[in-house]
């Protein structure tokens, strides 16, 4: 099976690696235009100049391209408490990270959000906090993990999932609230 | 105690159009971003769009961009998400949050209401 090619893609594999086909005339191969660039005029024949531009200030291009248009440069997303990496240039787009003892969560492929890294407390570090992954935390004996913190057993109702790490704990509750009724 | 109460969904027709309320109370609504997730029948959770307190520079997901706005009052704590051009891969529960801040979670979201995109 041959696999479904774009339009824009079809049209390229006429031609060698770092041209494009004239969308006017398919018997002539332009040269892209290099990343930081992007296609002002298609060359007007075979051998011949395409006429790329340099980007404007707030846009880039990331790779040999024959775009007509620069991409916009991202923005890093100040509600989401992300922070600037590094900064737009002509030939790459805006890095957008965390700030230190933080990390990514990806909500979506585009879209992430920076949180705290968990400290463990009432417990002990499993998995150290990574870039895009919170720290793994162990509870110690009398705690259970809830939303990655360490809470008491004592806020364990029967209805939730630490009934069974707790199990001692609600027994032993449990045990007491019954030794208390006649 | 913060309450968060959606309304204006329903069926309509694939190309037709809704617009989607949320009646905000219980914090400084003006402080807060402000997002809309949906959850298609059998699928997870998609975050669709969020707005910053000053209403500026949304954020909408590849797959509404161009189609739906989102917007603000903050004199009525009230949000909005207007959907156009409406597509089938539009019908879910729409529910509006407060953007998570301790973790990825949701702490405070409405109950939701149905959209449903068919002829």
């Known amino acids: 099976l041959v696999p479904h090619l774009g339009d824009r893609e079809k049209r390229d594999s006429v031609c060698p690696q770092g041209k494009y086909i004239h969308p006017q005339n398919n018997s002539i191969c332009c040269t892209k235009c290099h990343k930081g660039t992007y296609l002002y005029n298609d060359c007007p024949g075979p051998g011949q100049d395409t006429d790329c531009r340099e980007c404007e200030s707030g846009s880039f291009t990331a790779s040999e391209n024959h775009l007509r248009h620069c991409l916009s440069c991202s923005k890093c997303r100040k509600e989401m408490g992300q922070v600037e990496i590094s900064s737009c240039t002509v030939d790459r787009d805006t890095v957008c990270g965390c700030r230190k003892n933080q990390y990514r969560h990806y909500w979506s492929e585009n879209l992430f959000q920076c949180f705290n890294c968990s400290l463990c407390l009432n417990g002990t570090v499993h998995l150290s906090c990574q870039e895009k992954q919170n720290t793994v935390c162990t509870c110690h004996a009398g705690f259970f993990l809830r939303e990655n913190e360490c809470v008491s057993c004592s806020n364990c109702k029967k209805s939730l999932e630490c009934t069974k790490l707790c199990l001692p704990q609600i027994e032993n509750v449990k045990g007491t609230e019954d030794s208390g009724t006649t | 105690e913060v309450q968060l109460l959606e309304s204006g969904g329903g069926l309509v027709q694939p190309g037709g159009s809704l617009r989607l309320s949320c009646a905000a109370s219980g914090f400084t609504f003006a402080h807060e971003t402000m997002v809309w997730v949906r959850q298609a029948p059998g699928k997870g959770l998609e975050w669709v769009s969020h707005?910053?307190?000053?209403?500026?520079?949304?954020f909408y997901a590849d797959s509404v961009k161009g189609r739906f706005t989102i917007s603000r009052d903050n004199s009525k704590n009230t949000l909005y998400l207007q959907m156009n051009s409406l597509r089938a891969e539009d019908t879910a529960v729409y529910n509006c949050?407060?953007?998570?801040?301790?973790?990825?979670?949701?702490?405070?979201w409405g109950q939701g209401t149905l959209v449903t995109v068919s002829s």
């Open positions: 949050a407060l953007l998570p801040k301790r973790g990825p979670w949701f702490d405070y």
């Open positions: 707005i910053p307190p000053d209403g500026q520079d949304p």
